[in-house]
Amino acid sequence: FPQTTEKISPNWESGINVDLAISTRQYHLQQLFYRYGENNSLSVEGFRKLLQNIGIDKIKRIHIHHDHDHHSDHEHHSDHERHSDHEHHSEHEHHSDHDHHSHHNHAASGKNKRKALCPDHDSDSSGKDPRNSQGKGAHRPEHASGRRNVKDSVSASEVTSTVYNTVSEGTHFLETIETPRPGKLFPKDVSSSTPPSVTSKSRVSRLAGRKTNESVSEPRKGFMYSRNTNENPQECFNASKLLTSHGMGIQVPLNATEFNYLCPAIINQIDARSCLIHTSEKKAEIPPKTYSLQIAW
């Protein structure tokens, strides 16, 4: 038959490169199934382990004291034992639904007073970002991420990201990193594909959690932190990179089908702890210009 001389003409369905989206989704699914599956199927036990490792197998409440006065440099200690049985409200304290034993990022439960705990002070600014338009029925919930509620409100010059760390003895640490950055936290700000740098001026406060007998469920293959099958550690993708790696434009609202392509990558990124900063036991030191604080969602 005649050989075509035309260029690759991707199947651009609703503005996305479907071939790239499908293959990238399959890649992330393969990573997950390699860790938790058997013969390309996921048993209930494997699925349970996956949920445990991404921290959404059960709900526990911990109380995190946040510094809303951005000039204070002292450490905040959260007494998880003392406050574990009652709600404790003040204008400087917020309650975050984290599974304390899992020491990594979590998908927060929508059932647990999400709005009461973390009111969205930016809800009137949806028009600033083209992704917030209602095109194709897309609607971005403001509290899709468990880390969205770290601060009651985010100032124009600072972003706080809460991440978990672990050390070999089993002590859990909560690390709060505040770093200068103009603009708002995603989902309002999706246009920037470059994550903010954590500079030497960043303040790092570590909250030591209690020792616990509960441990993170290990995946079948024994992966823990960089458990991806590649030799290179998995990169932490922010919103823009997640979209572009699936052949999706960063200015186009997502519909449900398109979001479906992204789901394995999001789960894989959570499970591989790609967006956690692993500091040494002795001190939470972040050399200037070395690490970057990556905000995935």
Partner: antibody
Framework: EVQLQQSGTVLARPGASVKISCKAS????????MHWVKQRPGQGLEWIGA????????TYNQKFKGKAKLTAVTSASTAYMDLSSLTNEDSAVYYC???????????WGQGTTLTVSS | DVVMTQTPLTLSVTIGQPASISCKSS???????????LNWLLQRPGQSPKRLIY???KLDSGVPDRFTGSGSGTDFTLKISRVEAEDLGVYYC?????????FGGGTKLEIK
Amino acid sequence: EVQLQQSGTVLARPGASVKISCKASGYRFTSYWMHWVKQRPGQGLEWIGAIYPGNSDTTYNQKFKGKAKLTAVTSASTAYMDLSSLTNEDSAVYYCTSLLLRSPFDYWGQGTTLTVSS
Amino acid sequence: DVVMTQTPLTLSVTIGQPASISCKSSQSLLDSDGKTNLNWLLQRPGQSPKRLIYLVSKLDSGVPDRFTGSGSGTDFTLKISRVEAEDLGVYYCCQGIQFPRTFGGGTKLEIK
């Protein structure tokens, strides 16, 4: 015109390593995964693995883990496959291909013949 | 991995006569968007493989309409309404539902 231009025939000794290249032209290299396929003489097609040049994610057929290593240099629009610890079983034609699922076009390189012989 | 099983192994057909090749997958190739990721390829003697059909039944550019693909789920068929001399070679089905990609063992079409 889209082309996947592969490096020429390779003769190698058992135990050696070789690097096969695949230069893409006519499309944006970072828009598609690049796949590698093995075909032994008189045999069928066997998928080795694939790389996404946009971020160098790689996925392998378990059979070829440790045997093949895929890399890509986006500035040169070129994908590479390293084959190590060669044996006679590695003698085959190796193809790079876009192996597309939904697009109306699909592209294959002309193949690189590897002969492993002492 | 998804196992792709092709039959027959060899097909001898007279020019102008129809031909049919079957491909069965060990699991459904239906994707979450409702489309089925199955390709058919032809490898002529001494050449690289070339895709003929994608998404079960869509013809690649330049592929004659005497080729038709059909099927769903796990059972697929490639038909050639009237075989021509240039059709000889080995036909492969290939699944695109997951990594690793897998191919059928091939069906060799010979001209009687």
